[in-house]
């Protein structure tokens, strides 16, 4: 009988272990992308930006999905989303329409079921890139911890795309859950 | 029998609350490095800063070690890297040789394996100086989302830093480990 | 026999998976705060920001208590910290005093045992805000990982505080509990 | 070719002004800081001033402070050095010298004009 | 104001013979410190930076070591086009201040 018993016992912990280190993988989705250069959209008004490598360098997605540009929410959960974005321009690149620049980030979040789109997180700054310096460079960076329920959408737009610093260190976003909804 | 079942039950909830407990904190490195002023090198390109506080004041480090300038990771994860650079200049500082100057930060990734350096994070700003102000101040903040392996090497290199901030709320680094790699 | 011994397996997979989920929530205090735009203090100097919303749009709050303008630590644990500024000024808000300007922001942590405020975090830049532009912006954010108490308190100071910018997507800062202290 | 040269020298009397020259060619001008290095006659070198790149930071030893004045136009790739209140132990070779690239804070020079002399004398 | 003692003041030798110049500093100075060359009627050339950083151009023979006050000029074989006088300086303060010079002669 306590040979049985230790036997179960073994069998409870064993498969505990490997239920908890299972749960614990798979409740934490989380997404590295970082800009797709070959696909940058021109403008200097608000854009958005859709091309973002997901599998390449230090871009990777576990339990979340990349669609149409947009990172979609999986699973329910409290995330840590983050983004930075360089921009820069060398005067070899040719003459800036302005010297006064506002370069910006807003990481939204899209709820399908309620078609609106809101602003979580913002930042950047107003600039003013004269023709005295050869080169030129700002980065932004924004985080924050948020609420996201499963098949929501996260994107990013920023002003000036075209001054977009194409390197995988410098232009990215990501997102992490931190913990599940009450 | 009855009363050694609920033994053992107690004997299976009480070590897995132990173990639960212990596999957490040992499954969660971390570090928060901050700047030693004592030695900061010069020089105005990119530069490794080799010297950091990981037991006084802010700065700690837990299952991840330091060594020869570099935070080495122990164990294998995904982790959340961030640093925090500020840069300051007041007119009783020195003879500043420049208004135009590029303050950078860059998060590096060394494998001792491959022999190989990579950049995970960039951040900055070309920034204009002048004179006709006494003092001048510029933080830079980057983060993101890691697959690190046990035996790679987290390292900073910034430009001008003869211009940090030597303040441990202004000039540092960390780590956290957010989870196991599948 | 063995069916009493499956029952109470069950019994403790319940209980377990039960007790991990409910620790494993509980654990995690967060906090996501955003800045109160009818009660913005004026000045230039250092001033702390004692208005924000913890539990309405994007702010919430678990686990920890919001009082007196003060996030307050109701768990002993590691957690990260973070803090997204964002300043503006638009020509039709009437002339700047100054069209220099420093603005920064700081994250402190008082301790009610020992009186004492230090800071975790500082950020920012000096900034020329020329009347040569109509609109100026600039944005800090500052992150990192620190040990914190039950009964401590985190609190944001900035500069120049009638600059903010009052939406919810611009002025915020948090914390998430990472892991516990050994 | 990098070069410098100095113009402007010439014998004035104690208490009286010159103003010297340096005209850069073969680099980029705008991006370095420059200085005005003397020797006397038969002596070691003195730095006597230094500019910042775009011309908002000046630079003097006590010894001209107040009496000195360094500016620069940079669209001109020029440098100026505005001698007053003139004394005998300001008789030397003034050198126009470009600082280096290197630590913001840490000033030598790589390259040196062949100098212009001042000689202050009643 | 940091000041600089450089020696000797003057020296002379023979062609392929090592030549060795010292530079005190008043205060620490790091690794903060340049050597120059001034031939006779010329303007002075930069040699060395930064203690032992050789300038673009400039042969090895020529070298610079110490850090903090104590610093090391060589010439590891002199030749005959080496003759001049020779100056430090630190740049590691404003007001960048000058040895007094060594001048090398050649036997």
């Known amino acids: 009988g306590s040979q049985h018993i230790r036997a179960e016992k073994a069998m409870v912990d064993g498969s505990w272990l490997d239920l908890a280190k299972r749960s614990k993988l798979e409740a934490q989705p989380f997404a590295h992308l970082t800009i797709n250069a070959t696909d940058i959209p021109s403008g200097s008004h608000k854009v958005s930006l859709s091309s973002w490598y997901h599998d390449r360098g230090w871009g990777k997605i576990s339990n979340m999905t990349f669609s149409n540009g947009k990172l979609i929410v999986n699973q329910d959960g409290f995330y840590y989303l983050y983004a930075n974005i360089c921009f820069r321009h060398h005067e070899t690149s040719g003459d800036l329409a302005t010297e006064y620049l506002q370069l910006m980030v807003y990481v939204t979040k899209t709820s399908i079921k309620i078609p609106s789109s809101h602003t979580l997180m913002k930042g950047g700054s107003t600039k003013y890139w004269s023709g005295n310096s050869e080169f030129h460079f700002y980065s932004i960076n924004v985080g924050g911890f948020f609420k996201l329920r499963s098949g929501e959408e996260i994107s990013i737009e920023v002003s000036n795309p075209s001054l977009l610093d194409p390197d995988q260190d410098a232009t990215y976003f990501g997102a992490f859950k931190v913990r599940d909804i009450d | 029998g009855s009363q050694h079942i609920r033994a053992e039950k107690a004997m299976v909830d009480g070590s897995w609350l132990d173990l639960a407990k212990r596999s957490k904190l040992e499954a969660q490195p971390f570090a928060h490095l901050t700047i030693n002023a004592t030695d900061i090198p010069s020089g105005s390109h990119k530069v490794s800063l080799s010297s950091w506080y990981h037991d006084r004041g802010w700065g700690k480090i837990s299952n991840m070690t330091f060594s020869n300038g570099k935070l080495i990771v122990n164990q294998d994860g995904f982790y959340y890297l961030y640093a925090n650079i500020c840069f300051r200049h007041h007119e009783t500082s020195g003879d500043l040789a420049t208004e135009y100057l590029q303050l950078m930060v860059y998060v590096t990734k060394t494998s001792i394996k491959i022999p190989s350096s990579h950049t995970l994070m960039k951040g900055g700003s070309t920034k204009y100086w002048s004179g006709n102000s006494e003092f001048h101040f510029y933080s830079i903040n980057v983060g993101g989302f890691f697959k690190l392996r046990s035996g790679e090497e987290i390292s900073i290199e910034v430009s001008n830093p003869s211009l940090l901030d030597p303040d441990q709320d202004a000039t540092y680094f960390g780590a956290f480990k957010v989870r196991d790699i599948d | 026999g063995s069916q009493h011994i499956r029952a109470e397996k069950a019994m403790v997979d319940g209980s377990w998976l039960d007790l991990a989920k409910r620790s494993k929530l509980e654990a995690q205090p967060f906090a996501h705060l955003t800045i109160n735009a009818t009660d913005i203090p004026s000045g230039s100097h250092k001033v702390s920001l004692s208005s924000w919303y913890h539990d309405r749009g994007w702010g919430k709050i678990s686990n920890m208590t919001f009082s007196n303008g003060k996030l307050i630590v109701n768990q002993d644990g590691f957690y990260y910290l973070y803090a997204n500024i964002c300043f503006r000024h638009h020509e039709t808000s009437g002339d700047l005093a100054t069209e220099y300007l420093q603005l920064m922001v700081y994250v402190t942590k008082t301790s009610i045992k020992i009186p004492s405020s230090h800071t975790l975090m500082k950020g920012g830049s000096t900034k020329y805000w020329s009347g040569n532009s109509e609109f100026h912006f600039y944005s800090i954010n500052v992150g990192g990982f620190f040990k914190l108490r039950s009964g401590e308190e985190i609190s944001i100071e900035v500069s120049n505080p009638s600059l903010l910018d009052p939406d919810q997507d611009a002025t915020y800062f948090g914390a998430f509990k990472v892991r516990d202290i050994d | 070719e990098v070069q410098l040269v100095e113009s402007g020298g010439g014998l004035v009397k104690p208490g009286g002004s010159l103003r010297l020259s340096c005209a850069a060619s073969?680099?980029?001008?705008?991006?370095?800081?420059m200085s005005w290095v003397r020797q006397a006659p038969g002596k070691g070198l003195e730095w006597v001033s230094g500019?910042?790149?775009?011309?908002?930071?000046?630079y003097y030893p006590d010894t001209v402070k107040g009496r000195f004045t360094i500016s620069r136009d940079n669209a001109k790739n020029s440098l100026y050095l505005q001698m007053n209140s003139l004394r005998a132990e300001d008789t030397a070779v003034y050198y126009c010298a470009r600082r280096d690239y290197g630590d913001v804070y840490e000033w030598y020079f790589d390259v040196w004009g062949k100098g212009t002399t001042v000689t202050v004398s009643s | 104001d940091i000041q600089m003692t450089q020696s000797p003041s003057s020296l002379s030798a023979s062609v392929g013979d090592r030549v060795t110049i010292t530079c005190k500093a008043s205060q620490d100075v790091r690794t903060s410190i340049a050597w120059y060359q001034q031939k006779p009627g010329k303007s002075p050339k930069l040699l060395i930076y930064?203690?032992?950083y050789r300038y673009t151009g400039v042969p090895s023979r020529f070298s610079g070591s110490g850090s903090g006050t104590d610093f090391t000029f060589t010439i590891s074989s002199l030749q005959p086009e080496d003759l001049a006088t020779y100056y430090c300086?630190?740049?590691?303060?404003?007001?960048?201040?000058f040895g007094g010079g060594t001048k090398v002669e050649i036997k």
């Open positions: 300086q630190q740049h590691y303060s404003s007001p960048w201040t």
């Open positions: 500019i910042s790149s775009g011309g908002t930071y000046t």
């Open positions: 930064s203690a032992s």
């Open positions: 073969g680099f980029t001008f705008r991006n370095y800081a």
